[in-house]
């Protein structure tokens, strides 16, 4: 997370770490909890070519990585099966946990968007994660977990501004309509966030809008942070995890 | 000392029921997922199921998905199979061994039950 | 479902022979384990996450390989190593083994 400031011990209680197995459990994504048994993260973290079961574990919402882990088993990597790079879409994956999460104050499911919210510029969101806090600079231990309010920007402007300096013809979209961009020059997602929520309080209730997918570099000029817009893959979602009763 | 000690196997008709149990004792059981596997006369090892920790997650072999049941009781230290339209092909010796905790390899496994379908 | 194809499916070799076992993946996958079982035994476990040696295991045996091509090598064979090598995946249900391979004495 560029710029921000380290979350507050109560705050986004959906918020975990995956972990893939080498010398130890280290962070490698974020993801949320949307159901006791489901996390969604993105699926550049965990494809195309899907780690084993035995490679991958879930940490629940902790305020400093690797001080408290207890780590979590998945029974189900399912990476959309339209995912081939971010840039193209379809950058979201679900993972199953082998035992439902106990619900507490301190851990719970996020609420997903209904289809016809949009989430346009102005509304308050905010991206959490424990990626690096600038290009090429990790965060530094505690590792505490992050938190930025990032400003939404409209698809067509963000888009006009991923053309500004590139190669791709003004005609060919760069920002899809199942992105979503979000973040400025001092405020953005950054690698290692990959996977994680963005969410947006609206009528009193955070929802997650997106899921952290790419950009270029973090918190660039005319690059803002772009995520997998949620609304576009409910359905999919809905094909695996139950809805709240 | 860490055991699994499988029992209820036997001579059972085409078509028949079986439930096989395994008792374990030396370790937290409620803490690990627990697998079957079985070997055929002669022939390899073959995985037949697995149930997580908590009983929440349970996965077959295609062949015998419908047709076997893997469930524990924690409360009892004990993982079971129920079998049943048991076939000839189904004649094995039938193995209950733990997934490590944290490396998912079947560190633990018991001495084998045989189980014989046969008319 | 993922195959796993051990090769060869039996081999003879003496004493102090380098013994190598294949496993084959029908696609690609993170980690290999192996299992060692004599006759009228349980299995044992072997190797772990494609080259960790279970306890006990000696060192004159190690593992390798990755993606689809995993190996079991014995540096120098000894009496008791005369048993049967499975090769098994972990990457996603439902779980499978290898066919085996049974390494006897010349």
């Known amino acids: 997370i560029v710029g921000g400031q380290e979350a507050p011990r109560s705050k986004w209680p959906w918020q975990v770490s995956l972990r893939v197995h080498g010398p130890y459990w280290m962070h490698f994504c974020g993801g949320s909890l949307i159901h006791p048994q489901w996390v969604l993260t993105a699926a550049h973290c965990v494809g195309p070519d899907v780690k084993d079961l035995a490679a991958l574990r879930v940490q629940l919402r902790e305020q400093h990585l690797y001080y408290q882990d207890q780590l979590l088993p998945v029974s189900r990597i399912i990476v959309h099966p339209q995912f081939y790079t971010a840039q193209i879409g379809a950058d979201i994956a679900l993972l199953e946990l082998e035992e439902p999460v106990n619900v507490s104050s301190h851990v719970h499911t996020v609420t997903l968007p209904p289809a016809s919210e949009t989430f346009p510029p102005g509304m308050p969101c905010w991206v959490t994660g424990w990626g690096d806090v600038d290009n090429d600079e990790r965060l530094p231990p505690p590792f505490p977990l992050k938190q930025v309010k990032v400003p939404i920007m409209e698809n067509h402007i963000c888009d006009a501004k991923y053309h500004l300096g590139a190669y791709t013809g003004d005609d060919v979209r760069i920002v899809r309509d199942d992105m979503l961009c979000a973040g400025n020059t001092r405020r953005d997602s950054c690698q290692g966030d990959s996977g994680g929520p963005l969410v947006c309080k609206v009528n009193g209730t955070w929802l997650q809008a997106g899921v952290v997918s790419w950009g270029e570099g973090c918190a660039q000029p005319n690059r803002p942070g772009i995520y997998t817009r949620v609304t576009y893959y409910l359905d999919w979602i809905h094909h695996y995890v139950p809805k709240k009763p | 000392e860490v055991q699994l000690v499988e029992s209820g196997g036997g001579l059972v008709q085409p078509g028949g029921s079986l439930r096989l149990s395994c008792a374990a004792s030396g370790f937290t059981f409620s803490d690990y997922g627990m697998v079957w596997v079985r070997q055929a006369p002669g022939k390899g090892l073959e995985w037949v199921a697995f149930?997580?920790?908590?009983?929440?997650?349970?996965y077959y072999a295609d062949t015998m998905k419908g047709r076997f049941t893997i469930s524990r009781d924690n409360s009892k230290n004990t993982l079971y199979l129920q079998m049943n339209s048991l076939r000839a092909e189904d004649t094995a010796v039938y193995y209950c061994?733990?997934?490590?905790?944290?490396?998912?390899?079947?560190?633990?496994w018991g001495q084998g039950t045989l189980v014989t379908v046969s008319s | 479902d993922i195959q796993m194809t051990q090769s060869p499916s039996s081999l003879s070799a003496s004493v102090g022979d380098r013994v190598t076992i294949t496993c084959s993946a029908s696609?690609?996958?993170?980690?290999m384990y192996w299992y060692q079982q004599k006759p009228g035994k349980s299995p044992k476990p072997w190797i772990y996450?494609?080259?960790d040696l279970a306890s006990g295991v000696p060192s004159r045996f190690s593992g390798s390989g990755s993606g689809t091509d995993f190996t079991l090598t014995i540096s120098s064979l000894q009496p008791e190593d005369f048993a049967t090598y499975y090769c098994?995946?972990?990457?996603?249900?439902?779980?499978?083994f290898g066919q085996g391979t049974k390494v006897e004495i010349k």
């Open positions: 098994q995946h972990y990457h996603s249900y439902p779980l499978t």
């Open positions: 996450r494609t080259s």
């Open positions: 149930i997580s920790s908590g009983s929440s997650t349970v």
């Open positions: 061994t733990r997934r490590n905790y944290d490396d998912f390899y079947f560190d633990v």
């Open positions: 696609s690609s996958v993170t980690y």
